[in-house]
């Protein structure tokens, strides 16, 4: 994901009689004007703000990368939601890209969890039931569940 959020610039509101503790803030979907007097709408499909704020600019909408699908579009109050395409997933420790799911489990392991947009297939040792978190096995390592039947690919 290429998150192009602008730095959330804040400003000090001019000294003036305040009617409430939060006067000088603008609602979600808006940002504050340079002089602090007005609230300006974010531009639909271009930028957004999610909370009451005193940002000088709305935040730029994320564009989904190739290899991602758009689950929901950017509105003035919510950023785009992108998800990895079928057969790929995004790891917490490398959220910048979608990685291909493994097609099967290493020898001596069975698949207990399918490929999802947020996780690889899950494999456990046949006997102990402990999880395996190694690299994708080489093709020849892929086990067959029973003679002549390959382990199910991730759906």
């Amino acid at each position: 994901i290429t998150q192009q959020d602008l730095a959330p610039q804040q400003r000090v509101a001019p000294q003036q009689k305040r009617s409430s503790p939060s006067e000088g803030l603008c609602p979600p979907g808006h940002h504050i004007s340079e002089d602090g007097r007005d609230c300006i709408s974010c531009k639909y499909g271009q930028d957004y703000s999610t909370h009451w704020n005193d940002l000088l600019f709305c935040l730029r909408c994320t564009r989904c990368d190739s290899g991602e699908v758009e689950l929901s579009p950017c509105t003035t109050t919510r950023n785009t939601v992108c998800q990895c395409e079928e057969g790929t997933f995004r790891e917490e420790d490398s959220p910048e890209m979608c990685r291909k799911c493994r097609t099967g489990c290493p020898r001596g392991m069975v698949k207990v969890g399918d490929c999802t947009p947020w996780s690889d297939i899950e494999c456990v040792h046949k006997e102990s039931g402990t999880k395996h978190s190694g690299e994708a096995p080489a093709v020849e390592e892929t086990v067959t569940s029973s003679p002549g039947t390959p382990a199910s690919p991730c759906s």
Epitope: S19, P28, G29, H30, D38, S41, T75
Partner: antibody, heavy 119, light 107 residues
């Protein structure tokens, strides 16, 4: 269903103040911004200001800033608009209206309160 | 403040006619325009927001278009119940402002 029920018509003398109420029901009071919009007889609509019960944020149209006060009683889900130093040109129907915390359009309106300023 | 100029201010049309009301903003408001219908003695009702998005329950004969400074409300086939005054509103920058209204009647 969503309802915004306003107080009854008022007749006031020039220089006096008026306080109009708007009781909200049918939705979570703290999730929407409530506004006051007025309409002079045979005229267009004029936005006066907002109150957001979620954080007590208030914003006024500069035109009314010195004379209008918007308050709320969260225990009764009621918003009030007080306009002071009334003049004849303040004779109008005063509406409360709500909008989601997002774009500033109004999806539900109260029935309106006629305020007549006459000596 | 942004001025919203509506035209015409009065419009007479026949049932079944295609009716167009225009609204011009004094400066760029992107697509942040809403349209309301107001019947005599009643509060306004939201028809369109973001220039072209129909509000829930609004008949499909009502449509909106435009961006920047020029906006249009169209009724594709006028019905007797459409007799009302129509207002545009910019929700781009506070203070939010309304057009002067277009009173629509049946010929």
């Amino acid at each position: 269903q969503v309802q915004l029920v306003q107080s009854g018509a008022e007749v006031k003398k020039p220089g006096a103040s008026v306080k109009v109420s708007c009781k909200a029901s049918g939705y979570t009071f703290t999730e929407y911004i409530l506004h006051w919009v007025r309409q002079a007889p045979g005229q267009g609509l004029e936005w006066m200001g907002w109150f957001y019960p979620g954080n007590n944020n208030i914003k006024y149209n500069e035109k009314f800033k010195d004379r209008v006060t918007i308050t709320a009683d969260k225990s009764t889900s009621t918003v009030y608009m007080e306009l002071s130093s009334l003049r004849s040109e303040d004779t109008a129907v005063y509406y409360c209206a709500r909008h989601e915390q997002g774009p500033g359009y109004f999806d539900y309106w109260g029935q309106g309160t006629l305020v007549t300023v006459s000596s | 403040d942004i001025q919203m100029t509506q035209s015409p201010s009065f419009l007479s049309a026949s049932v079944g006619d295609r009716v167009t009301i225009t609204c011009k903003a004094s400066q760029d408001v992107n697509t942040a325009v809403a349209w309301y219908q107001q019947k005599p003695g009643k509060a306004p009702k939201l028809l369109i927001y973001w220039a072209s998005t129909r509000h829930t329950g609004v008949p499909s004969r009502f449509s909106g278009s435009g961006s920047g400074t020029d906006f249009t409300l169209t009724i594709s086939s006028l019905q007797p119940e459409d007799v009302a005054t129509y207002y545009c509103q910019q929700h781009y920058i506070t203070p939010w402002t309304f057009g002067g209204g277009t009173k629509l009647e049946i010929k």
